[in-house]
Interface confidence: low
């Protein structure tokens, strides 16, 4: 025998108190799949969270963060304070990048400047707190006619040699 609850569509629940008929989800609740015996409570976007998408009978609300903060985690479960470029967030608040490091975003951490000499290049443009250095041609290439400029190496990804 087929479970009568399997006929209940998303946005409803199978109400055991009413002979397993399909009842609409109550206000501020939802069911995103059919055959549910309960509806889930809608997420409420309060405080530093703001509503990006309202809850409906078939889908949960989605939150993002108020200006000055950005989302962290799956489904924006946390909001973290923005910093300025050239800074990183610590428990003591936003802190300027130390000399030799930079951060070109409002989030994340300060990263070391590219070491141009590792690739046999020279520094074409010095780094700042907000920008990486720009590596230029190797000193030996600095001869008439040599004009190519190499962009900075991309940030290291896992799987490459450790720092």
């Amino acid at each position: 025998l087929q479970d009568p609850c399997s006929n209940c569509p998303a946005g409803t629940f199978c109400d055991n108190n009413r002979n397993q008929i399909c009842s609409p989800c109550p206000p501020n609740s939802f069911s995103s799949a059919g055959g549910q015996r309960t509806c889930d409570i809608c997420r409420q976007c309060k405080g530093v969270f703001r509503t990006r998408k309202e809850c409906s009978s078939t889908s949960n609300a989605e939150c993002d963060c108020t200006p000055g903060f950005h989302c962290l985690g799956a489904g924006c479960s946390m909001c973290e304070q923005d910093c300025k470029q050239g800074q990183e967030l610590t428990k003591k608040g936003c802190k300027d990048c130390c000399f030799g490091t930079f951060n070109d975003q409002k989030r994340g951490i300060c990263r070391p400047w590219t070491n141009c000499s590792l690739d046999g290049k020279s520094v074409l443009v010095n780094g700042t707190k907000e920008r990486d250095v720009v590596c230029g041609p190797s000193p030996a290439d600095l001869s008439p006619g040599a004009s190519s400029v190499t962009p900075p190496a991309p940030a290291r990804e896992p799987g490459h040699s450790p720092q």
Epitope: L72, G73, M78, E80, E88, T90, K91, K92, Q105, R107, G108, I109, R111, P154, A155, R156, E157, Q163
Partner: nanobody, 119 residues
Framework: EVQLLESGGGLVQPGGSLRLSCAAS????????MSWFRQAPGKGLEWVAV????????DYADSVKGRFTISRDNSKNTLYLQMNSLRAEDTAVYYC????????????WGQGTLVTVSS
């Protein structure tokens, strides 16, 4: 210089447990949120968990929620990942990372520790 050294990986049977550690140095560990990521063979990088600087806030990828626990000991400059009810799909190289970045380029990474779940 920031250094992160993961350990604790190995071969474990499905349903088993492992505890990964990440020893941090070169920065004030207790001032920063920390994260775990993983990379399965032939796959892209996947965020696993994040922990606030004081350990009061955690968040997990849906794929590990209820099975993995991220924690830290600021007095030992060490981050942990307790992995329970391991599945074959948890097989990956696990990396700890300074900062709470979710799949953002340019984080500080360790060298990783391999976790293999197989019978």
């Amino acid at each position: 210089e920031v250094q992160l050294l993961e350990s604790g990986g190995g071969l474990v049977q499905p349903g088993g447990s492992l505890r990964l550690s990440c020893a941090a140095s070169g920065f004030t560990f207790g001032d920063y949120a920390m994260s775990w990521f993983r990379q399965a063979p032939g796959k892209g990088l996947e965020w696993v968990a994040v922990l606030s600087y004081d350990g009061s806030n955690t968040d997990y990828a849906d794929s590990v929620k209820g099975r993995f626990t991220i924690s830290r000991d600021n007095s030992k400059n060490t981050l942990y990942l307790q992995m329970n009810s391991l599945r074959a799909e948890d097989t990956a190289v696990y990396y700890c990372a300074k900062g709470p970045l979710i799949l953002a380029a340019g984080n500080y990474w360790g060298q990783g520790t391999l976790v293999t779940v197989s019978s």
